[in-house]
Interface confidence: medium
């Protein structure tokens, strides 16, 4: 298309801190929309800017502004991630544990200079509040992780940014959007008990406390029932149990019964990121000649 000699919009730019795509409007137009890649579209506020919620400061993204009348469009790429290739933090990962703690870790970029320092910022999707890392994990003075003991500022999806600084060269940044449900590691189930009568054994347990607000339907459990003093390589009995209001599993086991142990682990039914196993609970007799469960 031929370039408009008098475009209605000029000086398209991103105000990164405010997360606003803004421009100069040179004449009256009807309806302006902003499009991020193809994925998100939004109407402009008073035809003067678009307010975004979670712009990436690392992933180069196309931002297009379209005018309905007169028909016109223009675009920019943001950001232009400056800094030497390979200097950004890498192998970034976070996990929530013990229901209210989070650790994030990363590694120094392969081409980062010796004086590189990294800083972690977290922004939630709703309140646009920025959380700065309160406690850094260090390796030879370089920040390579972060510990948070207050997760009240997080929402279901959060934006993580690792910035870098150096006196020698520009450092690229790393960013990522993470869902809390995908990064939470459950504690094992608690209060595991086994009660047996002459014919059956009943295992009960409590669902683990979690950061997410989950119902019993969101849990899946695995029970590992293991007979003691068996030959190496003998298979354990792994039982899958769906979460219930009262978590219990009843299985036939007649007296006299050999010594067994049971341990349980938990996962989100949709993700199946298993927790560690609970402490093994033993039941039955020490006599190795008795029957199995």
């Amino acid at each position: 298309t031929k370039e408009d000699p008098n475009p209605p919009i000029t000086n398209l730019r991103m105000k990164a801190k405010a997360q606003q795509l803004t421009w100069d409007l040179n004449r009256n137009v009807t309806d302006i929309e902003c499009v991020k890649d193809a994925d998100y579209s939004m109407p402009a506020v008073n035809n003067s800017y678009c307010q975004f919620g979670a712009i990436s400061l690392c992933e180069v993204t196309n931002y297009t502004v379209r005018v309905a009348n007169p028909p016109f469009s223009t675009w920019i790429l943001f950001p232009e991630n400056s800094g030497r290739e390979g200097t950004a933090a890498q192998n970034f990962s976070c996990f929530i544990y013990n229901a209210d703690l989070m650790n994030c870790t990363w590694a120094r970029g392969p081409t980062a200079p010796r004086d590189v320092q990294y800083f972690l910022y977290i922004r939630n999707s709703k309140r646009r509040r920025e959380i700065r890392c309160p406690y850094y994990i260090q390796d030879s003075g370089t920040h390579v992780g972060c510990h948070l003991d207050n997760l009240s500022g997080l929402t279901s999806r959060n934006y993580f940014l690792v910035n870098g600084t150096s006196r020698e060269i520009g450092i690229q940044f790393f960013d990522s959007l993470l869902d809390t449900k995908k990064i939470e590691r459950f504690n094992p189930p608690s209060n595991v008990t086994v009660r047996c009568n002459t014919t059956h054994c009943l295992v009960r347990w409590k669902q683990p406390r979690t950061y997410q607000k989950l119902s019993y339907l969101d849990f899946q459990y695995q029970l590992d029932v293991h007979r003691k003093n068996t030959q190496p390589g003998t298979e354990n009995l792994l039982i899958n149990v769906s979460g219930d209001l009262e978590n219990r599993y009843n299985f036939p086991s007649s007296e006299p019964r050999a010594k067994h142990s049971v341990k349980i682990r938990a996962a989100d039914v949709r993700i199946l990121n298993w927790s560690s196993w609970s402490e093994a609970i033993e039941f039955g007799s020490d006599d190795g000649n008795l029957g199995s469960v």
């Epitope: 009807t30 309806d31 929309e33 991020k36 890649d37 193809a38 579209s41 939004m42 709703k126």
Partner: antibody
Framework: EVKLVESGGDLVKPGGSLKLSCAAS????????MSWVRQNSEKRLEWVAT????????YYPDSVKGRFTISRDNAKDSLYLQMSSLNSEDTAMYYC??????????????????WGQGTLVTVSS | DILLTQSPAILSVSPGTRVSFSCRAS??????IHWYQQRPNGFPRLLIK???ESISGIPSRFSGSGSGTDFTLNINSVESEDIADYYC?????????FGAGTKLELK
């Protein structure tokens, strides 16, 4: 319950024109971007057109640009596709599709949350 | 245009088994991949959005994963009602494009 009902499919000669309609119900039509997607006899899906909730902005792939026009009448809860200069490659089942709800102020118009049953367009002499 | 390649073209499985569908993009699309199911003589139905986000009303046996160029749709334990064609679609850039589909059939 979201319901999309397409109509207007027919047998048309090459070079001819046709207008498809889609009647929407079960949701606030004026709040959602809408699209047309077609599927040929080999079952290939192809996105054809998208219009934003207010009707000001339209999107087309190069294969139909200049020949097809998507429009909507929010007062009638209806979506339309005006097709002209039709050729045999336009033979397909045409589906009307609703985009997702708005999300933090964004209008997600790039994936298809609900589909109609389709209306068949055959271009042949 | 971004080309999406789905493999295999046909998958034959026994009921109760786990099955995986692959979708590969010709360039990085982040997580902007969506999955649809189309049963015989039916219309497409959204299963998974943004690579791994679940959809209300879709059975929990369906899950998705992947980012960049490689994506997977999993069915935990196939049921007879899952016999259908499965399509991926990208929304990273215009034009929106679909894969050619994978047909799931029972052994």
């Amino acid at each position: 319950e979201v319901k999309l009902v397409e109509s207007g499919g027919d047998l048309v000669k090459p070079g001819g024109s046709l207008k498809l309609s889609c009647a929407a119900s079960g949701f606030t039509f004026s709040n959602y971007a809408m699209s047309w997607v077609r599927q040929n006899s080999e079952k290939r899906l192809e996105w054809v057109a998208t219009i934003n909730s207010g009707g000001s902005f339209t999107y087309y792939p190069d294969s139909v640009k200049g020949r097809f026009t998507i429009s909507r009448d929010n007062a009638k809860d209806s979506l339309y596709l005006q097709m002209s200069s039709l050729n045999s490659e336009d033979t397909a089942m045409y589906y009307c599709a609703r985009q997702s709800e708005a999300y933090y102020g964004y209008d997600k118009r790039t994936w298809f949350a609900y589909w109609g049953q389709g209306t068949l367009v055959t271009v042949s002499s | 245009d971004i080309l999406l390649t789905q493999s295999p073209a046909i998958l034959s499985v026994s009921p109760g088994t786990r099955v995986s569908f692959s979708c590969r993009a010709s360039q990085s699309v982040g997580t902007s991949i969506h999955w649809y199911q189309q049963r015989p003589n039916g219309f497409p139905r959204l299963l998974i959005k943004y690579a791994s986000e679940s959809i209300s009303g879709i059975p929990s046996r369906f899950s998705g994963s992947g980012s960049g160029t490689d994506f997977t749709l999993n069915i935990n334990s196939v049921e007879s009602e899952d016999i259908a064609d499965y399509y991926c679609q990208q929304s990273k850039s215009w034009p929106l494009t679909f894969g050619a589909g994978t047909k799931l059939e029972l052994k």
